[in-house]
């Protein structure tokens, strides 16, 4: 009596997540949403862009999704940031994005239009139905790394990179064993996709967890080896550490403050 | 603050080693890289190379032969040696940090040491 | 190695007038560029990096400009202390180098 409960045959059983419920509907609400709130982006025709995000999976098999098959939906979310005011972050989403809420001249992926629509949500599709499945999807590692969500990542990853400028911030997360992961999306395709003929410094803020940690981060063997790929590709490397996250919040949001002078 | 100041002998002998020494304080030597710079009297600047904070070094190619840039952490101290000298590496020599920790040009220097180099 | 060219090598001028001092380099430095000024018997200082960037206590009257091979340094009123010799360089590529330097005198 049991095999009802499972997932007919027919469909192929992924090890990872389901399509988030109500996928088309918060994409077409975010989209909206986004559009309202920026100016510059007024333009875009919502429907039109999930029609384009719906394009690159739908009817596709999960495992052999390409960057090719989102380029209609890049084509719509093209978007103009300030290429100098850029925020990678690795493994510290939270507060990369708490950062560009109160410094609201810089940008990470997720304030852009098309990073925004994903962020947090997984999709896919099944090969030659039109459905989405909600059952589950693959796992990047379990199951195949060409699948959407993944493949939709490494491509808006490898663009937002390519079109940093200057001087490039980084956020990563002091309290991981790897500090620099080379197998994070920031590790394998932000970092070698900077440009050098546009990008003279990469600065990473090494983001302490513990309360007592007062130890130099900068100094940690991961550290050193983004140094010495990032010198390797003639761009300029800085590194600082932020010892007490939660001040540096509040000395981003008040400057004037007066312990906001000391190290933080 | 941050403080560089060369020192070594200022006048050396044609063929022999120029050996200089750069003390830093105010920063740390696995923090940043430090360059080594010269200038003969009445001319322009010549980078002469660098040693990284992980210990690696590049060289101006024009040198490369001569130059060896070592440093010892513990002393906050950086060597630089140039071997057969003649009249031609008469000149004054900097020390410098670069600006950022990997940085390719410098925003502290030493005040110099001028090093003639003659019989 | 990139050849950096400064022109003119000397310049004699009042205090108040505007300065214009220019650098080129033998190929595309892609805004790889510093300047320094040099004072008699002291070590050079940095100015400005990345071409337009002001370093922290460097007056607002020194600003920079350019692209690909050709850059420039612009005091707008020459002040007495701002009497010395400018150095621009480049750091695209290894070895790093300097143009051979303006000196700006007293008219």
């Known amino acids: 009596h049991h095999h009802h409960h499972h997932v007919p045959r027919w469909r192929q059983q992924w090890s990872g997540p389901g399509t988030t419920k109500r996928f088309p509907e918060t994409v077409l609400a975010r989209c909206v949403k986004y559009t309202e709130i920026h100016p510059e982006m007024r333009h875009v025709d919502c429907q039109s862009v999930w029609d384009a995000f719906k394009g690159a999976f739908i009817s596709k098999h999960p495992c052999n999704i390409t960057e090719e098959d989102y380029q209609p939906l890049m084509k719509l979310g093209t978007q103009t940031v300030p290429c100098n005011k850029i925020l990678l972050w690795s493994r510290i989403k939270d507060l990369a994005h708490q950062f560009t809420q109160v410094q609201r001249d810089m940008f990470t992926l997720e304030d852009t239009l098309l990073g925004y629509l994903a962020d947090d949500l997984t999709w896919c599709g099944e090969f030659n139905t039109s459905k989405i499945n909600y059952q589950s999807c693959p796992d990047w590692r379990k199951d195949c790394s060409n699948n959407p969500v993944s493949v939709f990542w490494k491509t808006v990853s490898r663009r937002f990179a390519e079109a940093a400028c200057d001087v490039v911030h980084v956020m990563l997360n002091g309290s991981r064993s790897k500090i620099f992961d080379k197998n994070s999306t920031f590790g394998s395709v932000e970092v070698h996709n900077l440009q050098p003929e546009k990008v003279q410094t990469l600065e990473a803020w090494v983001i302490h967890g513990g309360r007592e940690d007062s130890r130099d981060l900068c100094q940690d063997p991961t550290i050193k080896e983004l140094e010495s790929i990032i010198s390797k590709r003639n761009i300029q490397f800085s590194c600082k550490n932020i010892y007490r996250p939660d001040k540096f919040l509040q000395c981003v949001k008040n400057p004037e403050d007066s312990s906001c002078t000391s190290e933080i | 603050q941050v403080q560089l100041q060369e020192s070594g002998p200022g006048l050396v002998k044609p063929s022999e080693t120029l050996s200089l020494t750069c003390t830093v304080s105010?920063?740390?030597?696995?923090?940043?890289?430090i360059h080594w710079l010269r200038q003969p009297p009445g001319k322009g600047l010549e980078w002469i190379g660098v040693?990284?904070?992980?210990?690696?070094?590049d060289y101006n190619p024009s040198l490369k032969s001569r130059v060896t840039i070592s440093k010892d952490t513990s002393k906050s101290q950086v060597s630089l040696k140039l071997s057969s000298v003649t009249a031609a590496d008469t000149a004054v020599y900097y020390c410098a940090k670069g600006k950022v920790t990997t940085g390719f040009y410098f925003d502290f220097w030493g005040q110099g040491t001028l090093v003639t180099v003659s019989s | 190695e990139i050849v950096m060219t400064q022109s003119p090598p000397t310049l004699s001028l009042s205090p108040g007038e505007r300065v214009t001092l220019s650098c080129r380099a033998s190929e595309d430095i892609y805004n790889r560029l510093v300047w320094y000024q040099q004072k008699p018997g002291q070590a050079p200082r940095l100015l400005i990096s990345?071409?337009?960037s002001l370093e922290t206590s460097i007056p607002a009257r020194f600003s920079g400009s350019g692209s690909g091979t050709d850059y420039t340094l612009t005091i707008s009123s020459l002040q007495p202390e701002d009497f010395a010799v400018y150095y621009c360089?480049?750091?695209?590529?290894?070895?790093?180098?300097f143009g051979q330097g303006t000196k700006v005198e007293i008219k």
């Open positions: 040693i990284w904070r992980g210990g690696s070094t």
């Open positions: 360089q480049q750091y695209w590529s290894t070895p790093y180098t």
């Open positions: 105010g920063f740390s030597l696995t923090s940043y890289g």
């Open positions: 990345g071409v337009t």
